[in-house]
Structure formats: C-alpha cells, structure tokens
Interface confidence: low
C-alpha cells in the first residue's frame, strides 16, 4: 500500500456514532466498514480527523438526516465541514443546506460535501450540524473521510 | 497516464443506462464521457465495477431520480453503494436517502456519494436503488465510478 | 508537496462569487480558503479552470441555491459541469437536478457533482446553472475543484 | 486489536446439530459485521452467515438457509451459529470473522465432521 517510505498513503473513512452530547459537532467511530491507513491521521475524541503531514488533501462528509418543517426551526439543516489549525481559530471550509421537509413524521434527506485544501500537521477537521438529533444513523448513511493526494 | 509499470493509474467513470431488467441494481455502461484507465478495473454484465488489485480507493456515484409523494410507496428513496468480495456477502459501504417530492408529475432530486475504502482483489462495487424506474439517464444525471489512490 | 520533477501535484478549490452577469456560467474567485497549487491549473476569467497537462482529473462542484416553486419556472434548478477542450464543442460531464422547495421565500438545497475524467492540455471546466441568481454565496455553501490523479 | 476463539467443533452424525461459539476479546462487536466463514478440503473458503450487528441485518449462503442461525450476545462479547440438520457436506473447518478496516480478522477455526 505503500507509495514509498517517504510518501506512505494517508486516508481515512469513520462512520458515524449516535451520541447524548448536545454539541453539534458530529461524533464518529472506526468501526463497520471504516478506513484508518495509518497513524498519520489518527480519530481524536470521536470527533475529528487529525492529520500529522502537510499537504494537500481531498475532504469528504456525508450526512443523512430525518426532519420535518413544522417540528423544526425556520432555518434550514445546515452540515459545516470545519477546520482547526493549530494556534488558529476554527474555520468553515465548506458547508450545505437542506430545508426541511414537509414530509410526516420526518423526511430523509443526504447532503454530501467534498473538496481539496491544504492542511498544516496537527490540524484536524470536523463536521458541525444545526440539530445533531436529526442525523441517520443507520448503516452507510452518515460519514466522513479524507484522503492525502 | 503512468505512475510507474508497478503502479499504474487506476480509475473508471461510466454512465447509466436504461434497462428492462426489474432488478434494484443500477446498469453501466462505457459510453459518452466515460472512463476505463485499464484492465485493472472492468465494468461486468454491464452493473459492477471489479478491480483486480488490491488498495484504497476512492469510489463515487451519483443518482438523479424523478419521484412523487402520491405515486410512491412512502419508503423514501435510497442510493445504496455496495461491495461484494469474493467468497463474501454483499455489504453496504454508503446509503443515501431522499424523501420523495411533492411536485407533479414528479419532482427530480440527486444524490452523491462517496468514499474511501479498501478493496481486495477481484471485489466489485455495485449500486442498488429502492425503485430503478424513477432515476433519470439524460446526459450526466447518472453516473458511478472509482480510483485508486 | 511534490511527488517528483515531473510529476507535480495539480489541484485547485476555488470560491463562488456572486455575478450581476446574466450568464448562466458560475463566478469563482481565489479567496477565503481555496487552493490553487501551482500553474499547470489557472482559474480563466473567473470562470473556468484550466489544466495545462493530460490525464485524468477528479473535477467536482458544489452548488447551494434557494428557490421557491411558486416564484421558478416550472423546469427544476439543475446545475451543470462542463468541459471545453481546445478545437471541440463544449460537452456536459456531470448534472444534478433539484425541485424548487415549497417553503417561502424560499428553500435552501445542495448539490454535489463530482467524477473522473481525461482532461487534455489546454482543456477548461466549469459550470453552469439554470438560476444563478437563486444561488447562495455564504462562506462555504459554493465551491468547485479539481485534482490530478 | 480483536482477538477471536471458536470453539464447539466436533464429530456430529448427519441430521445432528452443534452449535459454535466464537469469543471476542479486545474490542466489542459493536456496530461490526461479524460472520462464520467455512473451508472445506480442498475448497475456497466461504462465507456462511454473517450478521450487521449494527441493525442485526442477516445473511446466509444458500446451502445453508433455514438449517443455520446466527446471532450474538453483545454483553458476552460473543457470536454464535447454530448448525441443524447437518450434511456430510457441511463438513469444514469454521472460522469466525470480524469484518474490520477492510478485511476480516480471523479466528484460529474449529473443526466440524459431520460423519456416520
């Protein structure tokens, strides 16, 4: 699997986990049909993907979730992919809204984020939600990766 | 195209296809804008992309579909990307799920999905749709593809 | 961040940018967290990005709007990737399809397009959508990339 | 890292049944596709019952549908596959799996000789 000593392949795919934190950042765990290549990018608290290599890397998210317009606030879901840098606040780098559904109880629907940044070693990425209490948690509905290019 | 004679490129991009069959499994095919690097990944009977060696690869797809609320079981519908390795059941890698439209005759939604995940030799990746009737096959609604990294 | 001499890496993100262009070919521009990794990929005009090597290209787009039924045409918000190569008609690669939300003044949705293509020297991306004015220019909400395999 | 132990093998004459066991130290079942694979002298190894213990999706092979059941005890740790109405076919060493970062992790197997 290697691209050579120097440059071993780094990349990572965490599924997500239901949680009772009320934070709205998304918790995940190596588990299922996860990916962790190596200790070069390490799951840190459950919450968020920390890599130890600059470099350029291609980012992913998936969410799922169940909501309906009347249960919900007027404000869309929103899914936030976010980065925190070492010594620098947090940043959004990318991020996707749905409005709710009219559908009753609830209606499913999946956002998908992804694009390439540059990460410095010792940052981390996470993805944030409006109402972490909406996300699916059923098999392949809601996860999150990276990949180094 | 090549990384070396060891370590070819790997990667394929094919388009949906129209098909009779009542099956939930989408078809391919190598037509329009397609991708086939090589022979170290194939599209066969038309539905599976298999790669020959083993790694981490990237593995996308994207389904364009045309539902109504009324006219649709009220499941809603669902992407599913699956895995099938040899001498091993079929597994999902990612779901995606979105709550039928309530615009007539029908309301078009898309879904992507992707991740990174490790393929042994000789695995093949298909996708499975709830109702293979509602997705849409005009020029680049469709589509379902995968690379090495 | 190179992989060799000959053999640099190539990947670009670039921002969306609102437009009182009529056009329905999405702005872009290099701010906030983007990337542009060296010159063998430029963003043209603000519009397109161009690659000055062969081969084969992970291109993707996300795109945020709001709409709201009533206020659209009939015709669902689709967004379109394209490609221009040098000598030849432009061709679609890529397109999503949303349904325009009932929820007033209007309703957030995202799309997310992304695959492998072969992009030759001098080739463009870009893409299109039916409303730009329905799109939404938030700190991450819109975003188009590419990366060289 | 998951260790894996089956145990409950042995000689059983057709039309018996015997029921496997396989102990999981390490890490908990949770949320892993756990499965019984078989390899018969000779043969290609081959998947025989595998559960998601996720949402408790089943899968069984063919040859085996209504004859085995899969199932789990999560607080013990521990999978199981009960085997009735075996066939002289069914004899094989079983092996359980953990399906884990995209390959299984395998137990050391347990002989089964279904024989008269």
């Known amino acids: 699997m290697q691209k050579g000593d120097q440059n071993p392949q780094i990349a990572a795919h965490v599924i997500s986990e239901a949680s009772s934190k009320t934070t709205s950042v998304l918790q995940w765990a190596e588990k299922g049909y996860y990916t962790m290549s190596n200790n070069l990018v390490t799951l840190e608290n459950g919450k968020q993907l920390t890599v130890k290599r600059q470099g350029l890397y291609y980012i992913y998210a998936q969410v799922t979730f169940c909501s309906n317009r009347e249960a919900s606030s007027q404000a869309p879901f929103i899914a936030s992919l976010c980065l925190k840098s070492p010594g620098r606040f947090e940043r959004i780098l990318l991020r996707a809204a749905n409005t709710h559904s009219s559908a009753k109880p609830c209606g499913q629907q999946s956002i998908h984020l992804g694009g390439v940044f540059e990460l410095q070693p010792g940052a981390s990425v996470f993805v944030n939600v409006t109402d972490p209490s909406q996300v699916s948690h059923g098999t392949g509905f809601t996860s999150f990766g990276l990949l180094k290019l | 195209m090549q990384k070396g004679d060891q370590n070819p490129q790997i990667a394929a991009h094919v388009i949906s296809e129209a098909s009779s069959k009542t099956t939930s499994v989408l078809q391919w095919a190598e037509k329009g804008y397609y991708t086939m690097s090589n022979n170290l990944v194939t599209l066969e009977n038309g539905k599976q992309l298999t790669v020959k060696r083993q790694g981490l690869y990237y593995i996308y797809a994207q389904v364009t579909f045309c539902s109504n609320r009324e006219a649709s079981s009220q499941a809603p519908f669902i992407a599913s990307l699956c895995l099938k390795s040899p001498g091993r059941f079929e597994r999902i890698l990612l779901r995606a799920a979105n709550t039928h439209s309530s615009a007539k005759p029908c309301g078009q939604q898309s879904i992507h999905l992707g991740g990174v995940f490790e393929l042994q030799p000789g695995a093949s990746v298909f996708v499975n749709v709830t109702d293979p009737s509602q997705v849409s096959h005009g020029t680049g609604f469709t589509s379902f593809g995968l690379l090495k990294l | 961040m190179q992989k060799g001499d000959q053999n640099p890496q190539i990947a670009a993100h670039v921002i969306s940018e609102a437009s009182s262009k009529t056009t329905s070919v999405l702005q872009w521009a290099e701010k906030g967290y983007y990337t542009m990794s060296n010159n063998l990929v430029t963003l043209e005009n603000g519009k397109q990005l161009t690659v000055k090597r062969q081969g084969l290209y992970y291109i993707y787009a996300q795109v945020t709007f709001c709409s709201n039924r009533e206020a659209s045409s009939q015709a669902p918000f689709i967004a379109s990737l394209c490609l221009k190569s040098p000598g030849r008609f432009e061709r679609i690669l890529l397109r999503a399809a949303n349904t325009h939300s009932s929820a007033k003044p209007c309703g957030q949705q995202s799309i997310h397009l992304g695959g492998v293509f072969e992009l030759q020297p001098g080739a463009s991306v870009f893409v299109n959508v039916t409303d730009p004015s329905q799109v939404s220019h938030g700190t991450g909400f819109t975003s188009f990339g590419l990366l060289k395999l | 890292e998951v260790q894996l132990v089956e145990s409950g093998g042995g000689l059983v004459q057709p039309g018996g049944s015997l029921r496997l066991s396989c102990a999981a130290s390490?890490?908990?079942?949770?949320?892993?596709?756990m499965g019984w694979f078989r390899q018969a002298p000779g043969k290609e190894r081959e998947e025989v019952a595998t559960?998601?213990?996720?949402?408790?999706?089943?899968y069984y092979a063919d040859s085996v549908k209504g004859r085995f059941t899969i199932s789990a005890d999560n607080s013990k740790n521990t999978a199981y596959l009960q085997m009735n109405s075996l066939k002289p076919e069914d004899t094989a060493v079983y092996y359980c799996?953990?399906?884990?970062?995209?390959?299984?992790?395998w137990g050391q197997g347990t002989l089964v000789t279904v024989s008269s």
């Open positions: 559960f998601y213990t996720g949402d408790g999706r089943t």
């Open positions: 799996a953990a399906w884990l970062n995209g390959g299984n992790r």
């Open positions: 390490g890490r908990t079942f949770s949320s892993y596709y």
